[in-house]
């Protein structure tokens, strides 16, 4: 069993290394920013990310592209729920520094939990998305 887990971990590690999780990150950021825009947030505030959604994208146009590519990437983990969880954790960790305040972090986490389901995939049963202040080791 230990041997199997070790092989599984290695397989998951290589799967994660070949996955492009950026479209998932962009898709989720678009979602929470769209929600904020509808509550009066300035949609023209500058961003550090060259591929962050433009105000036009945030109104829905272009967002389906990030979602489609994101779902394709997550689909690669469908047979390995633990690895799917690792992918979600990686997305959370990669974006944690860009989330402003507890509210945005909770919102991002909520959307992230729903992501597999949105893609028509099984969501991992137990998946801790808390990011420790020191940051989780990314392999």
């Amino acid at each position: 069993r230990q041997q199997w887990e070790l092989q599984g971990d290695r397989r998951c590690q290589s799967q994660l290394e070949r996955a492009n999780l950026r479209p998932c990150e962009q898709h989720l950021m678009q979602k929470i920013q769209r929600d904020e825009d509808s509550y009066g947030r300035d949609p023209y505030s500058p961003s550090q990310d060259p591929y962050s959604p433009s105000p036009y994208d945030r109104r829905g146009a272009g967002s389906s592209q990030h979602q489609e590519r994101c779902c394709n990437e997550l689909n690669e983990f469908e047979n390995n729920q633990r690895c799917m969880c690792e992918a979600l954790q990686q997305i959370m960790e990669n974006q944690s520094d860009r989330l402003q305040g507890r509210q945005q972090e909770q919102q991002f986490k909520r959307e992230l939990r729903n992501l597999p389901q949105q893609c028509g995939l099984r969501a991992p049963q137990r998946c801790d998305l808390e990011v420790e202040s020191g940051g989780r080791d990314r392999y």
């Epitope: 070949r18 492009n20 950026r22 479209p23 990150e25 962009q26 060259p50 591929y51 959604p53 036009y56 994208d57 146009a61 272009g62 389906s64 592209q65 990030h66 489609e68 590519r69 394709n72 689909n75 690669e76 469908e78």
Partner: antibody, heavy 122, light 108 residues
Framework: QQLKESGGGLVKPGGSLKLCCKA?????????MNWVRQAPGKGLEWIGS????????YYADSVKGRFTLSRDNAQSTVCLQLNSLTAADTATYFC????????????????WGPGTLVTVSS | YVMMTQTPSSVSEAVGGTVTIYCRAS???????LVWYQQKPGQPPKLLIY???TRATGVPSRFRGSGSGTQFTLTISGMKAEDVATYYC?????????FGGGTEVVVK
């Protein structure tokens, strides 16, 4: 890092053909693969893509239901089965490796095969 | 289905001149999914620019990609004879991953 298509040739309308693309010099199972065709003197037409573990396969509307994409990671090969061929399918068929920028995320086709010519004529 | 329209279909420019190629998408395309390729006669396409503005490895700085939303541009500043080719834009965010019709660049 190389790709090489094979299987092209002359085929009659309504006929079938199987094109394959053999990869070398890189870990094939790490990459999504795509097929693009180009009719003589015309532009590029994307015809299909297959993800690393074959879990997601897409086709252009013009070939849907007639062409089938498959891959064998152990053999580092991606194949395209062409059925119900018409003169409109006459083209050079390219396979292309899809990669992405690890830091920022954009996808692109960075390695292409030289292409294989398919001629559909009676 | 995102349709990509390139203009002009052909352009003639003197060596040293500037060539501007436009690519219009029928709906908004994220910069992340906009790519430019160069194809010379008898050869497969070659990656030029990805992410709308990032030059691929080994691509000279005279090639510049810009734009966002539905309007994208490829500019060749200080055209060289070796730049004679057909240039294609492609969106690869939504399947089908469509190419523009191509722009043939020739030397005047």
């Amino acid at each position: 890092q190389q790709l090489k298509e094979s299987g092209g040739g002359l085929v009659k309308p309504g006929g079938s053909l199987k094109l394959c693309c053999k990869a070398s010099g890189f870990t094939f199972s790490d990459y999504n693969m795509n097929w693009v065709r180009q009719a003589p003197g015309k532009g590029l037409e994307w015809i299909g893509s297959i993800t690393r573990s074959s879990r997601t396969i897409y086709y252009a509307d013009s070939v849907k239901g007639r062409f089938t994409l498959s891959r064998d990671n152990a053999q580092s090969t991606v194949c395209l089965q062409l059925n119900s061929l018409t003169a409109a399918d006459t083209a050079t068929y390219f396979c292309a490796r899809e990669d992405f920028n690890v830091y920022t995320g954009p996808y692109y086709y960075d390695v292409w095969g030289p292409g294989t010519l398919v001629t559909v004529s009676s | 289905y995102v349709m990509m329209t390139q203009t002009p279909s052909s352009v003639s420019e003197a060596v040293g001149g500037t060539v501007t190629i436009y690519c219009r998408a029928s709906q908004s395309v994220s910069n992340m999914f906009l790519v430019w390729y160069q194809q010379k006669p008898g050869q497969p396409p070659k990656l030029l620019i990805y992410g709308a503005s990032t030059r691929a490895t080994g691509v000279p700085s005279r090639f510049r990609g810009s734009g966002s939303g539905t309007q994208f541009t490829l500019t060749i500043s200080g055209m060289k004879a070796e730049d004679v080719a057909t240039y294609y834009c492609q969106q690869n965010g939504n399947s089908p991953y469509t190419f523009g019709g191509g722009t043939e660049v020739v030397v005047k």
